[in-house]
């Protein structure tokens, strides 16, 4: 029996009965928040062999082992993960061992076993036999191994029953509990699974099988399951579903969902049966089961019940995330906010069409409307009193509408109104009239030439750069000295610069009136010598990085109609020189024969240029005399080498720190102080723990129904 799509057992342990007939859980299994300690011995689910997503256990009082509950759980596929993890055991107060002695494979994802005060038998499990990579496993804050005294079956009687493997240079027996060994297949099977009698399974089997070399006898499938057989790919006219089985078109068409988007059912795309078309695709017709690529962003129609959507905060803007067509009117009223421009762009940047009007008033936090970066059509089907479909009133810091060189916006019906926008130049408004096709619709009072732009430098001259010089982390630029009509009114210059991977930035990107600005700013005083051109050295830059730079003159000059005259440059794009790359990451070496080493690494995090080749150096090391000091035939006499792992649980530090011997006969001395790197690593570790715990709580706690 297949159960799903995910099972959430909480509050009442008797809900476990829901697992009674499940052989496969198509989805996740949550067992959590059972605060009353119960006797779980009568609950046993031997039929359950596969969980296709993840297993999460959290605060289940009284549960001491998972082995009795799930004696035959063999595979956790990790098709979807819980914060990158396929197995999470968190704050299980009474759990003494994991005990999943038939667990052979976690196909994707890592494990997180944290804050289980009584949990032992963690160091006796070789997770590398179950997972592909153990480097992302997080096993912290459980019962200290030295308090556990984990013993594998038969060790006390000197008749050890379990096999040994090496973990962190420790060669030891591998087991799940005092009476359950960790199963290992013969090396002749390679990556294949094996039966209880150590016969190799069919290559398409995963975890285990009931008969050797038989693709119909698998406990779970390596790739896909179809009609009782494990197959490498789904046969023709069948489709992948939930990452583990093949289904036909009829099956896919008859899946019912409780999601609000279910009116059209599941789709078939790229050989897979899925709930919705993936990003960048849209259904080929409203009742179609097939997807076609979108032209540009995929359309998403959003509607406001009350017709007018007020955007007065990031939270209200959040409701429009992903919307491309807004049915209704937009009223933007942003008085304050943190990082408001980029937040609004994030949530409203895909809107292309507004069917009603757009009104921007009292939005003192806005410097530009460029956050509506894809708006191309205002239909004006509904208009404000006076037939206005674009209305801009009293925005104290608004300086730019859009970058009209890169913007096509049409206002199909209705007029525009602008008043009391002191930093918005009238020329900017006139330009909008031309672009939007509204020229001639406005009457004289609709664009007020007195109170729009009264505090802006609207008559701008162009500053020209005269030289640029670069090194790996510096840029030197100079520009023509600007000479306004009255030289006394030129106060200084301001240089704006920022990283710009692409040549598409504008002056107002990420800028708002509340202090957020994606540009770095540097003030440059006038050179005392009138003949010297002003310039600046920008330092502390990244190597091989393109920067955008522009300069503005800071002036006082007034012209006849009381508007300030100013000057600024075009945006200049300039790249710093290449430099030495940072070190390659994750260097691993392994020997695959007596005369070969295989070395692998990842590219450096900071290439600082175009990488053309790597240099690999090696040298022979003398044999470690340490290896000859011990009698390796005597049982359990292999010394344990301790390796610092850079993290420590505070509660475990109980001894006097003054016990380390500092070489020779110097006697005890203090532990070395932590390096900055170690402190930083600890800080990041603590932060990571918090982030995970928040994610866990946010994911599983739901409000009670009213």
């Amino acid at each position: 029996e297949i159960c799903g799509p995910g099972i959430d057992i909480r509050n009442d342990y008797q809900q476990l009965k829901r697992l009674e007939n499940c052989t496969v859980i198509e989805g996740y299994l949550h067992i959590l928040l059972i605060s009353k300690a119960e006797d779980y011995r009568s609950y046993r689910f031997p039929k359950l062999t596969v969980i296709t997503e993840y297993l999460l256990l959290f605060r289940v009082a009284g549960l001491e082992s998972l082995g009795d509950l799930f004696p035959n759980l063999t595979v956790i596929r990790g098709w979807k993960l819980f914060y990158n993890y396929a197995l999470v055991i968190f704050e299980m107060t009474n759990l003494k061992d994991i005990g999943l002695y038939n667990l052979r494979n976690i196909t994707r994802g890592a494990i997180r076993i944290e804050k289980n005060a009584d949990l032992c038998y963690l160091s006796t499990v070789d997770w590398s036999l179950i997972l592909d990579a153990v480097s992302n496993n997080y096993i912290v804050g459980n019962k200290p191994p030295k308090e556990c005294g984990d013993l594998c079956p038969g060790t006390m009687e000197e008749k050890p029953m379990c096999e040994k493997t090496t973990i962190n240079n420790e060669y030891n027996y591998r087991c799940w509990t005092t009476n359950r060994c960790q199963k290992m297949c013969p090396s002749t099977c390679g990556k294949r699974a094996c039966t209880e009698n150590n016969e190799c399974c069919h290559p398409e089997c995963l975890g285990s099988c009931s008969a050797p070399d038989n693709d119909t006898a698998c406990v779970a499938c390596r790739h896909y399951y179809y009609a009782g057989v494990c197959v490498p790919a789904c046969p023709p006219n069948t489709y992948r579903f939930e990452g583990w089985r093949c289904v036909d078109r009829d099956f896919c068409a008859n899946i019912l969902s409780a999601e609000s988007s279910d009116s059209e059912g599941f789709v078939i795309h790229d050989g897979e049966c899925m709930q919705e078309c993936p990003s960048g695709f849209i259904r080929n017709g409203s009742q179609s089961m097939y997807c076609i690529p979108c032209e540009g962003p995929c359309p998403k129609v959003c509607e406001e019940e009350k017709k007018t959507k007020t955007i007065d905060s990031v939270t209200s803007a959040q409701m429009l995330q992903g919307c491309t067509i807004f049915k209704g009117n937009l009223l933007i009223n942003i008085r304050r906010g943190n990082n408001i421009a980029s937040e609004l762009e994030n949530f409203m940047g895909l809107i292309e069409v507004v069917t009603g009007y757009v009104k921007i008033r009292h939005s003192h936090a806005l410097v530009s409307l460029s956050f509506l970066k894809n708006l191309r059509l205002i239909l004006g089907e509904e208009q404000l009193e006076g037939n206005y479909s674009f209305y801009v009133l009293d925005n104290q810091n608004l300086q730019q509408l859009w970058d009209w060189d890169h913007r096509n916006l049409t206002i199909k019906a209705g007029k525009m109104y602008f008043a009391f926008n002191p930093k918005l130049c009238v020329s900017e408004i006139y330009r909008m009239e031309e672009v939007t096709g509204t020229k001639g619709r406005q009457s004289k009072g609709d664009i007020n030439t007195r109170n729009n732009g009264e505090r802006a430098s609207c008559e701008s001259d162009v500053l020209h750069f005269t030289s640029t010089t670069t090194s790996k982390n510096r840029i030197i630029i100079t520009w023509h000295r600007y000479r306004p009509p009255d030289y006394r009114d030129l106060i200084s210059f301001t240089v704006y610069y920022k990283e710009a991977p692409f040549k598409n930035v504008t002056e107002y990107d990420g800028q708002d009136a509340c202090g957020s600005n994606s540009w770095n700013m540097v003030d440059v005083d006038l050179p005392p010598n009138k003949d010297v051109e002003p310039g600046i050295l920008l330092h502390g830059l990244k190597p091989w990085t393109q920067y955008a730079v522009y300069v503005k003159a800071v002036t006082l000059t007034m012209v006849e109609n009381d508007h300030i005259r100013g000057a600024k440059s075009e945006i200049l794009y300039i790249r710093t020189n290449a430099s030495v790359p940072s070190i390659p990451l994750d260097v691993l070496s392994a020997s695959n024969s007596s005369s070969q080493l295989i070395v692998k690494w990842n590219p450096p995090s900071l290439p600082n240029g175009n990488l053309s080749y790597y240099i690999v150096r090696w040298q022979r090391q003398p044999q470690d005399g340490y290896l000859y000091r011990h009698n390796y035939c005597s049982k359990d006499k292999i010394p344990i080498r301790k390796y610092a792992d850079g993290t420590i649980d505070i509660e475990e530090v109980t001894e006097n720190p003054k016990t380390e011997v500092c070489g020779g006969e110097k006697g005890p001395c203090c532990a070395c102080p932590k390096t900055e790197a170690e402190k930083q690593a600890e800080k990041e570790e603590a932060e990571y723990r918090k982030v995970f715990e928040n994610f866990l709580h946010n994911s599983i706690f739901v409000p009670r129904p009213e």
Partner: nanobody
Framework: EVQLVESGGGLVQPGGSLRLSCAAS????????MSWFRQAPGKEREFVSA????????RYADSVKGRFTISRDNSKNTLYLQMNSLRAEDTAVYYC????????????????WGQGTLVTVSS
Amino acid sequence: EVQLVESGGGLVQPGGSLRLSCAASGRTFSSFVMSWFRQAPGKEREFVSAISGSGSRARYADSVKGRFTISRDNSKNTLYLQMNSLRAEDTAVYYCAANPRRATPDLTQYAYWGQGTLVTVSS
């Protein structure tokens, strides 16, 4: 936890009609796919019909297609099964079931079940 209570069962003559109701409480009703199953005396429980969370899509067992109609009223947290042209072989205990998020055509292990209501079709 979701509680489901069926009602509307009873004795009806062949060719007659009956409307079953299932009242749900405890969680947001619309976030569940709802279904009707039935179990005739001495037989296995079998699928009858299911409906999506919004009520926009439904599916039926071949044996009841064209005779039974499933519907739901999310504002009243209630599921319905309108049964027309009833036959003797429709005699069974009818169960209402709920499953969160979605239900595949082969799903029989629903998360929540009602106690059932008996429908007897006999002359």
